[in-house]
Amino acid sequence: FERTRSLQDPCSNCPAGTFCDNNRNQICSPCPPNSFSSAGGQRTCDICRQCKGVFRTRKECSSTSNAECDCTPGFHCLGAGCSMCEQDCKQGQELTKKGCKDCCFGTFNDQKRGICRPWTNCSLDGKSVLVNGTKERDVVCGPSPADLSPGASSVTPPAPAREPGHSPQ
């Protein structure tokens, strides 16, 4: 049996997909089915993640990399590496302990996940409400009332109608 690797630390050259037992002469062993080692020199192979139930397989496990899961339709991932699946709600709703509930007046959610958030308070920025908010959409803030006075520069002011005999101020 021939090994083609260098003679330094015996474990360092055990490739990904194998594990190393430095108590034995024959050092590298292949990972058994449904296990993996993603780096060389590992002392054990890790059991592949299984995407079951509400999880579905996004990427199959291999001897050198773990499986990756996502969520079945109607659910979305939460946490690092999709460690949890949470039920989707409709836009305009949020998930509570009792299921999906419509956003209260004055709040909105434009996604299938997350919580309802308060509409933007346009007046805090000295602006006025251009488009009213809904359960699914935030308000759209427009220019402040002062911005709409004649002569003031504004993002989208309509051109003031001129009265005969008057010149622009």
């Epitope: 049996f1 090994r3 083609t4 690797r5 050259n13 055990c14 490739p15 990904a16 997909g17 194998t18 034995r24 002469n25 024959q26 590298c28 062993s29 292949p30 990972c31 058994p32 089915p33 449904n34 990427k59 199959e60 291999s62 001897s63 050198t64 990399s65």
Partner: antibody
Framework: EVQLVESGGGLVQPGGSLRLSCAAS????????MHWVRQAPGKGLEWVAY????????YYADSVKGRFTISRDNAKNSLYLQMNSLRAEDTAMYYC???????WGQGTLLTVSS | EIVMTQSPATLSLSPGERVTLSCKAS??????VSWYQQKPGQAPRLLIY???NRYTGVPARFSGSGSGTDFTLTISSVEPEDLAVYYC?????????FGGGTKLELK
């Protein structure tokens, strides 16, 4: 669906050379080490060679050391076995298998005879 | 190298019988033993890995046990399609080695 398809077998005279190929599909070939295993007619299974996923680590059985060379082309999802100085005792069905040894191809038959 | 020895070489039985196949390793191989089924003209098929884990799609009548040097494959109730040669193999260390096989045939 995982598939491994061997090709390249045939009749060769003693001392001759041949290259076997294994075409892989249905899985991420570049993430798996690969084996060649052979089976002489009416006999048991004999492991021949292993190559790691990236090709950096290679092991051979003593019976083929110095005569056979295992290699792979991850861009082509292909595994190879170059066989030189062939002997009658190399006559066998040659299988490729993933390093989990869970999926095997259907094999390609090598016959070494004069 | 690690030598895997299977017994018996041949087993004659009737459908519905319980059958136990034996595999012994020449040295400790932990639980790194797999069992394969091979029918005439076909490639080997993985049944059991890690001594006792049934591979995907393998019927529940197949089970494996053992660790160290002694391993067993049990078929709880043999079906006609189970008639084949069964090999054990170790992946504890290179070179990977296999037993000589046990042939299951009809009485």
């Amino acid at each position: 669906e995982v598939q491994l398809v061997e090709s390249g077998g045939g009749l060769v005279q003693p001392g001759g050379s041949l290259r076997l190929s294994c075409a892989a599909s249905g899985f991420t070939f570049s993430e798996f080490g690969m084996h060649w295993v052979r089976q002489a007619p009416g006999k048991g299974l004999e492991w021949v060679a292993y190559i790691s996923s990236g090709g950096s680590t290679i092991y051979y059985a003593d019976s083929v050391k110095g005569r056979f060379t295992i290699s792979r082309d991850n861009a082509k999802n292909s595994l190879y076995l170059q066989m030189n100085s062939l002997r009658a005792e190399d006559t066998a069905m040659y299988y490729c298998a993933r390093d989990w040894v869970d999926y095997w191809g259907q094999g390609t038959l090598l016959t070494v005879s004069s | 190298e690690i030598v895997m020895t299977q017994s018996p070489a041949t087993l004659s039985l009737s459908p519905g019988e319980r059958v136990t196949l034996s595999c012994k390793a020449s040295e400790n191989v932990g639980s790194y033993v797999s069992w394969y089924q091979q029918k005439p003209g076909q490639a080997p098929r993985l049944l059991i890995y890690g001594a006792s884990n049934r591979y995907t799609g393998v019927p529940a009548r197949f089970s494996g046990s053992g660790s160290g040097t002694d391993f067993t494959l049990t078929i709880s109730s043999v079906e006609p399609e189970d008639l084949a040669v069964y090999y054990c193999g170790q992946s504890y260390s290179y070179p990977l080695t296999f037993g000589g096989g046990t042939k299951l045939e009809l009485k």
